[in-house]
Interface confidence: medium
Amino acid sequence: QRFAQAQQQLPLESLGWDVAELQLNHTGPQQDPRLYWQGGPALGRSFLHGPELDKGQLRIHRDGIYMVHIQVTLAICSSTTASRHHPTTLAVGICSPASRSISLLRLSFHQGCTIASQRLTPLARGDTLCTNLTGTLLPSRNTDETFFGVQWVRP
Amino acid sequence: QRFAQAQQQLPLESLGWDVAELQLNHTGPQQDPRLYWQGGPALGRSFLHGPELDKGQLRIHRDGIYMVHIQVTLAICSSTTASRHHPTTLAVGICSPASRSISLLRLSFHQGCTIASQRLTPLARGDTLCTNLTGTLLPSRNTDETFFGVQWVRP
Amino acid sequence: QRFAQAQQQLPLESLGWDVAELQLNHTGPQQDPRLYWQGGPALGRSFLHGPELDKGQLRIHRDGIYMVHIQVTLAICSSTTASRHHPTTLAVGICSPASRSISLLRLSFHQGCTIASQRLTPLARGDTLCTNLTGTLLPSRNTDETFFGVQWVRP
């Protein structure tokens, strides 16, 4: 019985399965386009199993290929608001270490008030992911409208 | 040889890998905003491996963290139709048991005719997921335009 | 020690975990609506572990259920461009073998300049996936704006 349990735990411990789903905490100060995230069961349905938060940014703890996904909804928004405040753009990227800095995922809102996408990308232990929202519109903090997550897929 | 087969089956049986991809069956009666889903190889490319359908709603059979994804396309739609009928909103949530009722994912159509998104969320055995489409526009039943699915990711 | 290593490799080798993330190489000639993809570490963050490219189209090497995802951004685009050139549509489907030809995922741009979606679908060894972009607008080749990938999920 103990052996069977150990078998079950193998993928979680040795193979990874690192996973995180975050909710929006706050936007950055005036000149900082980054969104700051939070996660944990006390906050609702957000969680971190493996990755960690470093000053509101997501830091990877295990090398591998990850599925990165995000949805951001603008708070006070109609299609006319979105087009009038264009360009409002969301970019997800590796922001540190600086030597690995790169944009992974980029979307503009145009006449919509929500963007949602996902992609597979290799990430390394220590990579910190930042999500930059440029423009004057504010994101909704509703947990079903704005969220950001990663899922380890394979080494 | 039998041992190798048993090894292969371990993750499917003991670790889960529950997965479902559903196609739209029909919308609800007048006061019921829920979409009713169907799945199975006889219907095309939809399937249920683990989760079950309960009166067109998806019921979870295994505790864990799931990737939930959805795409809904409005049937007779242009950007002017979509904006004229605004707000048309799609919400995915746990609708039963009532004690766990919560909205997991919400998107508005604004001037678009398709919404698509995905998120990671903890689900428990017995959770039933409902997809509520509010507004007067009808969803397309084309299987490449409207679909809803879940994938077990880890315990 | 060697046994532990073999254990870790089991899921990768015998259970699959085939995965690919591609970047846009080029569009097809006049009458060919297909997008042509490329992948490999020399190109940046794209890769193929299992699936292969056949003249820019993605060929599956292992039977199973896959998560297919795509994002396509139009190159010189505003909401007025997108609506003026409507319909611009993106479809992902099995294009060969001809006996299995089917559309898996379809989205229109309407007044937006980016589409992004994902779905679970059964695929078989030898299936080739094609991505057809119909309309007169051209896709962006920026690797954070346009990408296409698959992830093996379970047998």
Epitope: Q23, L24, N25, H26, T27, P29, Q30, Q38, A42, L43, G44, L138, R141, N142, T143 | - | -
Partner: nanobody, 116 residues
Framework: QVQLVESGGGLVQPGGSLRLSCAAS????????MAWYRQASGKQRELVAL???????NYADSVKGRFTISRDNAKNTVYLQMNSLKPEDTAVYYC??????????WGQGTQVTVSS
């Protein structure tokens, strides 16, 4: 817990002005943003103006240039100054506060009627 009490609603002629107040009490240190919503008869509740803890502000298109949201931290109060009022501004106006854990708190609402 956060308690919110609105005041300042009433009947006003088109083109007139009103100032709504929302006084917050309780766990106010936990508040991230405060907002004014409105709900006209038979319509969905809509977000009108939003002010977040670092001072950023957004307005709905329909009120931009006419309404101003502000706050007095010393009094734990948020205001909505409404000028050039129109009949379509008639609604029940609700004060909303959201804490850092994205929990919503609501006031009881105050009626604003714009009519000649």
């Amino acid at each position: 817990q956060v308690q919110l009490v609105e005041s300042g609603g009433g009947l006003v002629q088109p083109g007139g002005s009103l100032r709504l107040s929302c006084a917050a009490s309780g766990s106010i240190a936990s508040i991230y943003h405060m907002a004014w919503y409105r709900q006209a008869s038979g319509k969905q509740r809509e977000l009108v103006a939003l002010i977040i803890s670092d001072g950023k502000i957004n307005y709905a298109d329909s009120v931009k240039g006419r309404f101003t949201i502000s706050r007095d931290n010393a009094k734990n109060t948020v205001y909505l100054q409404m000028n050039s009022l129109k009949p379509e501004d008639t609604a029940v106006y609700y004060c909303n506060a959201q804490n850092w854990a994205t929990r919503d708190y609501w006031g009881q609402g105050t009626q604003v009627t714009v009519s000649s």
